[in-house]
């Protein structure tokens, strides 16, 4: 039985041409996290495996860093950016958790944000 | 066209230590993991590990750990293998192979340097 | 380490004829599994990825399915340049392991 649930940042804003950490939190199980997927819509962004270490995908590999932790920090954003983000959590025993964050990409400097996951 | 070109056969002396070359070329060098693979005549697949370009990082076989080192040249695109304290068993065919867009799989193989130990 | 174990050994089969190779391994790889195909002396070559991404320039005639722990491999209407050996490998931890192989021959 599934008794995990996935903490996110949730929704998010960041100015265009900074930086951003997206972060999940599995909590509640004592499975065992085997891998943790990033996903842009269909697109992948990185894989973090318990035993093979990240996998960042060629496309982002100039501006995506590995961390904190199972997070993934985003930098140099772009508007193009903005969209929904997907953490997938392979765990045994219990399967796979997902959790989602919407990022908006700001023009201007009125970007807010959490300063729990803000890059300064 | 994305190619990785191995160096040539070597014939070698129980105990002794080669290093191999794989060069790559027509696409970004730092932005996909390389791979070194065994195969035995006639016999299966064996992964070695691999080499981030990126950043020098590496991940290893635990089989493979204090037999082979892997490193890489960003300069001139060139990933290389070094093994050591070679015998009959290290007589195979090795494969360099860039690591797929999505994962720890083989999109890109090159042709393969054929190793002999021999006295 | 995760054991992946192919069947059948070997395969005998005529041009035309549709053929399906399985792969099975001993713990759940989600859908982490590549198949490759090696002709006699050469390297292999990738043919699907994520057990069912097609990859580039492979024929459609190739298809993968499965999750989980079982998995398979059809080819559709064999083609002369289809004969070799086939080879499963989960991308799922470390060591990244391969399947024994099939080897294909023409009948």
């Known amino acids: 039985m599934m008794t995990g649930t996935i903490e996110t940042t949730g929704n998010i804003s960041a100015e265009k041409g900074g930086s951003i950490i997206l972060q999940c939190h599995l909590s509640s199980t004592t499975a065992q996290v085997t891998q943790v997927n990033w996903e842009q819509q269909d697109q992948l962004l990185a894989i973090c495996n318990a035993d093979l270490g990240w996998h960042i995908s060629p496309s982002f590999k100039d501006r995506v860093a590995p961390g904190p932790g199972l997070g993934l920090t985003l930098q140099s954003l772009t508007v193009n950016d903005t969209g929904e983000y997907f953490c997938i959590y392979h765990t045994y025993p219990d399967g796979t958790y997902t959790g989602r964050i919407f990022l908006e990409v700001l023009e201007s400097s009125v970007a807010e944000h959490g300063a729990r996951f803000q890059i300064p | 066209e994305v190619q990785l070109q191995q160096s040539g056969p070597e014939l070698v002396k129980p105990g002794a230590s080669m290093k191999m070359s794989c060069k790559a070329s027509?696409?970004?060098?730092?932005?996909?993991?390389m791979h070194w693979v065994k195969q035995k005549p006639g016999q299966g697949l064996e992964w070695i590990g691999y080499?981030?370009?990126?950043?020098?990082?590496?991940k290893y076989n635990e089989k493979f750990k204090g037999k082979a080192t892997l490193t890489s040249d960003k300069s001139s695109s060139i990933a290389y293998m070094e093994l050591s304290s070679l015998t009959s068993e290290d007589s195979a065919v090795f494969y360099c192979?860039?690591?797929?867009?999505?994962?720890?799989?083989?999109?890109?193989w090159g042709a393969g340097t054929t190793v002999t130990v021999s006295s | 380490d995760i054991q992946m174990t192919q069947s059948p050994a070997s395969l005998s089969a005529s041009v035309g004829e549709t053929v399906t190779f399985t792969c099975r391994t001993n713990?759940?790889?989600?859908?982490?599994l590549t198949w490759y195909q090696q002709k006699q002396g050469k390297s292999p070559q990738v043919l699907v990825y994520?057990?069912?991404t097609l990859a580039e320039g492979v024929p459609s005639r190739f298809s993968g399915s499965g999750s989980g722990t079982q998995f398979s491999l059809k080819i559709n209407s064999l083609q002369p340049e289809d004969f070799g050996s086939y080879f499963c490998?989960?991308?799922?931890?470390?060591?990244?392991?391969f399947g024994a192989g099939t080897k294909l021959e023409l009948k």
């Open positions: 080499i981030d370009p990126y950043n020098d990082g590496s």
């Open positions: 994520n057990a069912k």
């Open positions: 713990e759940n790889i989600y859908s982490y």
């Open positions: 192979a860039r690591g797929g867009s999505r994962g720890w799989y083989f999109d890109v």
């Open positions: 027509g696409y970004k060098f730092t932005s996909y993991v």
């Open positions: 490998q989960h991308h799922f931890g470390n060591p990244l392991t």
